[in-house]
Amino acid sequence: QEEDLPRPSISAEPGTVIPLGSHVTFVCRGPVGVQTFRLERDSRSTYNDTEDVSQASPSESEARFRIDSVREGNAGLYRCIYYKPPKWSEQSDYLELLVKESSGGPDSPDTEPGSSAGPTQRPSDNSHNEHAPASQGLKAEHLY
């Protein structure tokens, strides 16, 4: 009998409000044994896959998706999904990335580091859970 796959989680480091030109890393988490993590942008039509999976805790694995220099076009909704043979998980909640104009001072308020909840996270539409194989679709250069 196939196991029920837990929903992945998504978070962003250092937060979800990022100054223009700064870096952000999306962190997707799922159970041990995930083969591929996918970061989806706005809808399933644009995504990035990675098989670079590592431990997050004794019961969790994670993958990281880094954007080195955030542009205005990177703002939007992101969510994670993973493939653990023989099937894909459902999607995580959406995480909204906000890009702000760089401000001079270091004291400008940012989202807390590692933020993954709050008003910028939206529930996902889990009504459709069939996904293209990891070898198809738009890759990192399209997402980032």
């Epitope: 159970p31 896959d49 670079d52 431990q55 004794p58 993958a63 990281r64 880094r66």
Partner: antibody, heavy 119, light 107 residues
Framework: EVQLVESGGGLVQPKGSLKLSCAAS????????MYWVRQAPGKGLEWVAR??????????YYADSVKDRFTISRDDSQSMLYLQMNNLKTEDTARYYC??????????WGQGTLVTVSA | DIQMTQSPASQSASLGESVTITCLAS??????LAWYQQKPGKSPQLLIY???SLADGVPSRFSGSGSGTKFSFKISSLQAEDFVSYYC?????????FGAGTKLELK
């Protein structure tokens, strides 16, 4: 079909240097973590080094026994993995395997290349 | 560093029998454990990952169990090609350590 082909092994004197290469094919190299593992003649397996993908900022990790002497690197455009080995010691004599990660585990192994450190 | 204590170092068995190998981790590793098979002169092959998951193409006579610090690997109905070496490995924390290995011998 996943293929990992190591090269660059050979006989080298103590304190010498050697650079191992691994040509990868049959999978999306740039989205995978890659590893080097070694096995001394008649002995068990020892993890040597790990390099993560660009999405994880090419982070590198090393076994204490090789830290500050070995450097793992990759060329995603050529699907190549490297291990630069400096200040070699007799105890570095081993077969060196190039390994592809999968689910965070060592899913695919090359055939290995033999490094012999001897005066 | 996490030490992996694998036992037995060697074991004799007959064709068709079942054998079990154990691996003890010096601290909890959840299910970040793999089992590999190595034939003489060949590269290791992943058999079990995430403690219990069978790798692609691996026969169902191989199985893994356990979590935390105690893990077992079982081969049921031994075939001639199974009399080789087996290693456990933890992938929970760097350095990624292996057990010392178990050599299966034909009785």
């Amino acid at each position: 079909e996943v293929q990992l082909v190591e090269s660059g092994g050979g006989l080298v004197q103590p304190k010498g240097s050697l650079k191992l290469s691994c040509a990868a094919s049959g999978f999306t190299f740039n989205t995978n973590a890659m590893y080097w593992v070694r096995q001394a003649p008649g002995k068990g397996l020892e993890w040597v080094a790990r390099i993560r993908s660009k999405s994880s900022n090419y982070a590198t990790y090393y076994a204490d026994s090789v830290k500050d002497r070995f450097t793992i690197s990759r060329d995603d455009s050529q699907s190549m993995l490297y291990l630069q080995m400096n200040n070699l010691k007799t105890e570095d004599t081993a077969r060196y395997y190039c390994v592809r990660g999968g689910s965070g585990f060592f899913a695919y192994w090359g055939q290995g290349t033999l490094v012999t450190v001897s005066a | 560093d996490i030490q992996m204590t694998q036992s037995p170092a060697s074991q004799s068995a007959s064709l068709g029998e079942s054998v079990t190998i154990t691996c003890l981790a010096s601290q909890t590793i959840g299910t970040w454990l793999a089992w590999y098979q190595q034939k003489p002169g060949k590269s290791p092959q992943l058999l079990i990952y995430a403690a219990t998951s069978l790798a692609d193409g691996v026969p169902s006579r191989f199985s893994g169990s356990g979590s935390g610090t105690k893990f077992s690997f079982k081969i049921s109905s031994l075939q001639a090609e199974d009399f080789v070496s087996y290693y456990c490995q933890q992938l929970y924390s760097t350095p990624l350590t292996f057990g010392a290995g178990t050599k299966l011998e034909l009785k």
